[in-house]
């Protein structure tokens, strides 16, 4: 079996305040089983942005049909961007378990926020 890769094709994304930011992420395999999570920042203080498995994330929507079993596109859209949203976002694959364990992370996408056009 080919080892799963987490691909974040965009090194950086720039969005005007008030707009939506699309952060791209795909995986190359359905194995191992386990959810995708998005974080802002790295390390113990990272902030959970989206969890495929559970939780309520009102500003986040999935770009593709994530309800399909064969889905390998875990890109997300974050609405109403503000300067406080700036940072590096990581798409992280978890492996099912008790509890789920981190399996592989994407390289990250840096989100910068431009001033709202007047």
């Amino acid at each position: 079996e080919e080892e799963l890769q987490v691909i974040q094709p965009d090194k950086s994304v720039s969005v005007a305040a008030g707009e939506s930011a699309i952060l791209h992420c795909t995986v190359t395999s359905l194995i191992p089983v386990g959810p995708i999570q998005w974080f802002r920042g790295a390390g113990p203080a990272r902030e959970l942005i989206y969890n495929q498995k559970e939780g309520h994330f009102p500003r986040v929507t999935t770009v593709s049909e994530s309800t399909k079993r064969e889905n390998m596109d875990f890109s997300i859209s974050i609405s109403n961007i503000t300067p406080a949203d700036a940072g590096t976002y990581y798409c992280v694959k978890f492996r099912k378990g008790s509890p789920d364990t981190e399996f592989k992370s994407g390289a990250g996408t840096e989100l910068s926020v431009r001033a709202k056009p007047s």
């Epitope: 079996e1 194995i31 995708i36 495929q52 559970e54 889905n71 099912k96 378990g97």
Partner: antibody, heavy 128, light 107 residues
């Protein structure tokens, strides 16, 4: 407590069809992969069929592919195995099995690599 | 396929190790299932490689490294006499099982 209770076994005639039912309690079958494992007399455990937590993904062992159908009824909390065109080699004890992983999101499979609960089994004898 | 020894024996109080090897990558887990008599219900003693279900004595433990899993019974007791099946999965099989290891507790 999680329990699995199988029924539907007994003496069967070759060529006929069989319907086994597994009733689960103590958990929601809509969140777990479920399956059937059989044991022929004097033999080991053999995977037969599984159904994913989504209720639509299924998998069958080569020995029963084309003859078996696994379905579930969330309301009744049951998993059913229909096995057609019975053969002598289908004789054995059929166990219902539940996977441990709670999977209520889309990209799960129908695998049973973390079985945490088994039924008591129902014996099937195929003989003329 | 999963390969495990056909039989092991031990005296009460000894430590027993049963191995299970296959083509398993890191993508799937191993479990261990105890069957006290043919046709009786298996009991899961280890799942997720090393997790013990509630109600299973602490003398049962498990580990996995690469494609090999090990069931360890520390201080084996007479009531542990049974057949132990290892189980896992592979890319084309949702569940695969070893042929079983018969544990005999002597004395």
């Amino acid at each position: 407590a999680v329990t699995l209770d199988e029924s539907g076994g007994g003496l069967q005639t070759p060529g006929r069809a069989l319907s086994l039912v597994c009733r689960g309690s103590g958990f929601s079958i809509s969140s777990y992969n479920m399956g059937w494992v059989r044991q022929a007399p004097g033999k080991g455990l053999e995977f037969i069929a599984s159904i994913g937590s989504d209720g639509s993904s299924t998998h069958y062992a080569p020995a029963v592919k084309g003859r078996a159908t696994i379905t579930r009824d969330v309301g009744q909390s049951t998993v059913r195995l229909q096995l057609n065109n019975l053969r002598a080699e289908d004789t054995g004890t059929y166990f219902c099995a539940k996977d441990a992983y709670q999977c209520s999101y889309a990209t799960c499979n129908d695998y049973l690599d973390t079985i945490d609960a088994w039924g008591h089994g129902t014996e099937v004898i195929v003989s003329s | 396929a999963l390969t495990q020894p056909s039989s092991v024996s031990a005296n009460p109080g000894e430590t027993v190790k049963i191995t299970c090897s296959g083509d398993n990558s890191a993508h799937y887990y191993y479990g261990w299932y105890q069957q006290k008599s043919p046709g009786s219900a298996p009991v899961t003693v280890i799942y997720y490689n090393d997790k013990r279900p509630s109600g299973i004595p602490s003398r049962f433990s498990g580990s996995a490294s690469g494609s090999t899993a090990t069931l360890i019974i520390t201080g084996v007791q007479v009531e542990d006499e049974a057949v132990y099946f290892c189980g896992s999965a592979d890319s084309s099989n949702p569940a695969i099982f070893g042929a079983g290891t018969t544990l005999t507790v002597l004395g």
